[in-house]
């Protein structure tokens, strides 16, 4: 004959422990039904009486299978420097991640106790490391041959265009400008994809005849050291 | 806490060179260019120039390009200067300052290094 | 090179006064300015960056302005512990500082 089912609540057999979604009740020595997820022991089992089980009040949660006697309360609301990716139920608790622009520069258990805008490369600086959702951007200084104009979170450094005859240099933080109508290349190709700027940006203000016609080849390699250079933007 | 420390006081005869050097913790150290600024006895302050520690890429004012060499060490955060041919007015403080390249400019500095020139 | 000319060189004032020190630039750097304190025998102190941008800590007593390539740092109500000298710093192209400022007990 095939074992009886027990129904909760049910002394277990000595050495045995309760099935699954099921606890030992320490006074009633039964095991006894557990409250879904939702749900919160209103009242503990007995020996003939299984748990009694209610709903989460607003504003709380029990995320688990579950025998204790209160919901446990959602975490405050986001801050304005956060979005709430997950809303309050009586299933889960609120989670809170930084917005766009910034990242979580200290964590909690699930989402974000802190977040702190992402650093903004000046003028000519690039972003070498983006940012992510919890670490912040790395700027570098713009290589020979590269600039950046902006203060920004996002832009790297962009090569220089390429002139038939420059009007002005390039520097770290300017562009080259031409003296023809059209340069006859405005960036080396692929360049702009650079995970990191090379970071020399000597010799950007060198009163050289044509600095920018022939353009360093050092940031068009996908990332690493260029050799100290010897030079300055100085005063 | 961030911190710049520098290493302690030199006396040089004219001609000579010095090598200072700064110190870094509390933070990412490759993560901020380092820049050197020295001050003469009752004067300004005058940027020299920087370094990444990253790569070791610099730029140095044109002031001092002949003569200054800047170098760092990642494995034990430190930054050097190095300044040759020593002369009289070269007696100055010599600051490491951090740079992580956003506005916020040179948040954090050592304490100083004074370099005597004298014969 | 952008030069910085600031001014005036040396100032003396008393405790509650209101304090301007200027700084001009010998051309556009847009709001890449800023400002250090510096007391005898200690390291520069940032105060203002992006010309407005007050460091984390300094007193809000401090606050900088702009009008063109003229740069301002004004103390609202001078306290004992602003007696230092001044430095502005131009890091727009290249780097420079101005000449600084010698805030004085009057």
């Known amino acids: 004959l095939p074992a009886q089912v027990a129904f909760t609540p049910y002394a277990p057999e000595p050495g045995s422990t309760c099935r699954l979604r099921e606890y030992y009740d320490q006074t009633a020595q039964m095991c006894c039904s557990k409250c879904s997820p939702g749900q919160h022991a209103k009242v503990f089992c007995t020996k003939t009486s299984d748990t009694v089980c209610d709903s989460c009040e607003d504003s709380t949660y029990t995320q688990l299978w579950n025998w204790v006697p209160e919901c446990l309360s959602c975490g405050s609301r986001c801050s304005s420097d956060q979005v709430e990716t997950q809303a309050c139920t009586r299933e889960q608790n609120r989670i809170c991640t930084c917005r766009p622009g910034w990242y979580c520069a200290l964590s909690k258990q699930e989402g974000c106790r802190l977040c702190a805008p992402l650093r903004k490369c000046r003028p000519g600086f690039g972003v070498a490391r983006p940012g992510t959702e919890t670490s912040d951007v790395v700027c570098k200084p713009c290589a020979p041959g590269t600039f950046s104009n902006t203060t920004s979170s996002t832009d790297i450094c962009r090569p220089h265009q390429i002139c038939n005859v420059v009007a002005i240099p390039g520097n770290a933080s300017m562009d080259a400008v031409c003296t023809s109508t059209s340069p006859t290349r405005s960036m080396a190709p692929g360049a702009v994809h650079l995970p990191q700027p090379v970071s020399t940006r000597s010799q950007h203000t060198q009163p050289t005849p044509e600095p920018s016609t022939a353009p360093s080849t050092s940031f068009l390699l996908p990332m690493g050291p260029s050799p100290p250079a010897e030079g300055s933007t100085g005063d | 806490q961030v911190q710049l420390v520098q290493s302690g006081a030199e006396v040089k005869k004219p001609g000579a060179s010095v090598k200072v050097s700064c110190k870094a913790s509390g933070y990412t150290f490759t993560d901020y260019i380092i820049h050197w600024v020295r001050q003469a006895p009752g004067q300004g302050l005058e940027w020299m120039g920087w370094?990444?520690?990253?790569?070791?890429?610099?730029d140095y004012a044109d002031k001092f390009k002949k003569r200054v060499t800047m170098t760092a060490d990642t494995s034990i955060s430190t930054a050097f200067m190095e300044l040759s041919r020593l002369r009289s007015d070269d007696t100055a403080v010599y600051y490491c300052?951090?740079?992580?390249?956003?506005?916020?400019?040179?948040?954090?500095w050592g304490q100083g290094t004074l370099v005597t020139v004298s014969s | 090179d952008i030069q910085m000319t600031q001014s005036p060189s040396s100032l003396s004032a008393s405790v509650g006064d209101r304090v301007t020190i200027t700084c001009q630039g010998s051309q556009n750097i847009d709001n890449y300015l800023a400002w250090f304190q510096q007391k005898p025998g200690k390291a520069p102190k940032l105060l203002i960056y992006s010309t407005y941008s007050l460091q984390t800590g300094v007193p809000s007593r401090f606050s900088g302005s702009r009008s063109g390539t003229d740069f301002t740092l004004t103390i609202s109500s001078l306290q004992p512990e602003d007696f230092a000298t001044y430095f502005c710093f131009q890091y727009n192209q290249g780097y420079m500082f101005g000449g600084g400022t010698k805030l004085e007990l009057k």
């Open positions: 370094i990444d520690p990253d790569y070791g890429n610099t």
């Open positions: 300052a951090r740079d992580d390249g956003s506005p916020l400019v040179m948040d954090a």
